[in-house]
């Protein structure tokens, strides 16, 4: 039975050329948290964060993502087009896979507000 | 569709350093979800897995092997390579490359192989 | 590390019969981390089975995969000419390192 909640930082806006962390943290469970896989709203693969062999940073973003804090991400750099979705699956055990998800809107405007508070979606 | 082509001397002496090198085609060695490894089949006898590498050049090796073994990686020509230092009788084997799936979790396998290339370490 | 132990060594059969080959784990390994690999004679392994029970990409569903905790079973339901074979199982973990069984060989009655 699957009883943990994702907790993300949920829609947050961040301003063009900056910085943005990307979290999410997994409560009310026990489970173990074997990989967490960060995807884009296109769902292409932007980390992975494997319990046994740490963080693998996929080849299209290996110079503008940092891994961290802790199991979230910080993107770099930030363009327009990295406005969208954006989705941090946990894969636990015994549970199974546990899903967040995060809105990013980059902003031109350099007074760019970036909310921190977690949400559960 | 994807496919390694293991190469490199067939005949080693002893006490000297096996190397090896695995060619992907069809496919970027580079595509972030999978690592490459090498596996080995002395003759008649079962598999033995040395070590694998991903693109960044992250490893991971067998405890038995390591203090021996060097996988490394180039992208640039889509290869990795085995170097195993200070040979005996006893490596002698057929080497294998693969794609090694360790990072998709339910499909961890070795899911494509070279055909291999056989090894003998004698003087 | 994970000691995997196949049984029986050799399993000798006709085509048509029913195949059930052994894998067992020295310690409890995930069901997502067992796989099952075919070789056939001057060959490379080919992988039949991963997660313990899917099969990839083009193999026949007369091969199935079923199993947990220490204990793996590889069913061939008919045996066809060109399954006679060696098989092994393999568990993918990283600590422990990843082992392969020694190896079942399906040789014609």
């Known amino acids: 039975m699957m009883t943990g909640t994702i907790e993300t930082t949920g829609n947050i806006s961040a301003k063009k050329g900056g910085s943005v962390i990307l979290q999410c943290h997994l409560s009310s469970t026990m489970a173990q948290v074997t990989q967490v896989n960060w995807e884009q709203h296109d769902h292409s693969l932007l980390a992975i964060r494997n319990a046994e062999l740490g963080w693998h940073i996929y080849p299209a973003f290996k110079d503008r993502v940092a891994p961290g804090p802790g199991l979230g991400l910080t993107l770099q750099s930030l363009t327009m087009n990295d406005t969208g979705e954006y989705f941090c699956t946990y894969h636990t055990y015994p549970d199974g896979t546990y899903r967040g998800r995060i809105f990013l809107e980059v902003l031109e405007s350099s007074v760019a507000e970036h909310s921190a508070r977690f949400q559960i979606p | 569709q994807l496919q390694l082509q293991e190469s490199g001397p067939g005949l080693v002496k002893p006490s000297e350093t096996l190397s090896l090198t695995c060619t992907v085609s069809?496919?970027?060695?580079?595509?972030?979800?999978?690592?490459w490894g090498w596996i080995r089949q002395p003759p008649g006898k079962g598999l033995e897995w040395i070590g694998s590498i991903y693109y960044s050049g992250q490893t991971y090796y067998n405890p038995s092997l390591k203090s021996r073994v060097t996988i490394s990686v180039d992208t640039s020509k889509n290869q990795f390579s085995l170097k195993l230092s200070s040979v005996t009788a006893a490596d002698t084997a057929v080497y294998y490359c693969?794609?090694?799936?360790?990072?998709?979790?339910?499909?961890?396998?070795?899911?494509?192989w070279g055909q291999g290339t056989m090894v003998t370490v004698s003087s | 590390e994970i000691v995997l132990t196949q049984s029986p060594g050799t399993l000798s059969l006709s085509p048509g019969e029913r195949a059930t080959l052994s894998c067992r784990a020295s310690?409890?390994?995930?069901?997502?981390?067992l796989a099952w690999y075919q070789q056939k004679p001057g060959q490379a392994p080919r992988l039949l089975i991963y997660g313990a029970s899917s099969r990839a990409t083009g193999i026949p569903d007369r091969f199935s995969g079923s199993g947990s905790g220490t204990d793996f079973t590889l069913t061939i339901s008919r045996l066809e000419p060109e399954d006679f074979a060696v098989y092994y199982c393999?568990?993918?973990?990283?600590?422990?390192?990843?082992?392969f069984g020694g190896g079942t060989k399906v040789e014609i009655k």
């Open positions: 693969a794609r090694d799936g360790v990072l998709t979790l339910n499909k961890r396998s070795f899911d494509i």
């Open positions: 310690q409890s390994v995930s069901s997502s981390y």
């Open positions: 393999q568990q993918h973990t990283v600590r422990p390192p990843l082992t």
């Open positions: 069809g496919g970027s060695i580079a595509s972030g979800s999978y690592y």
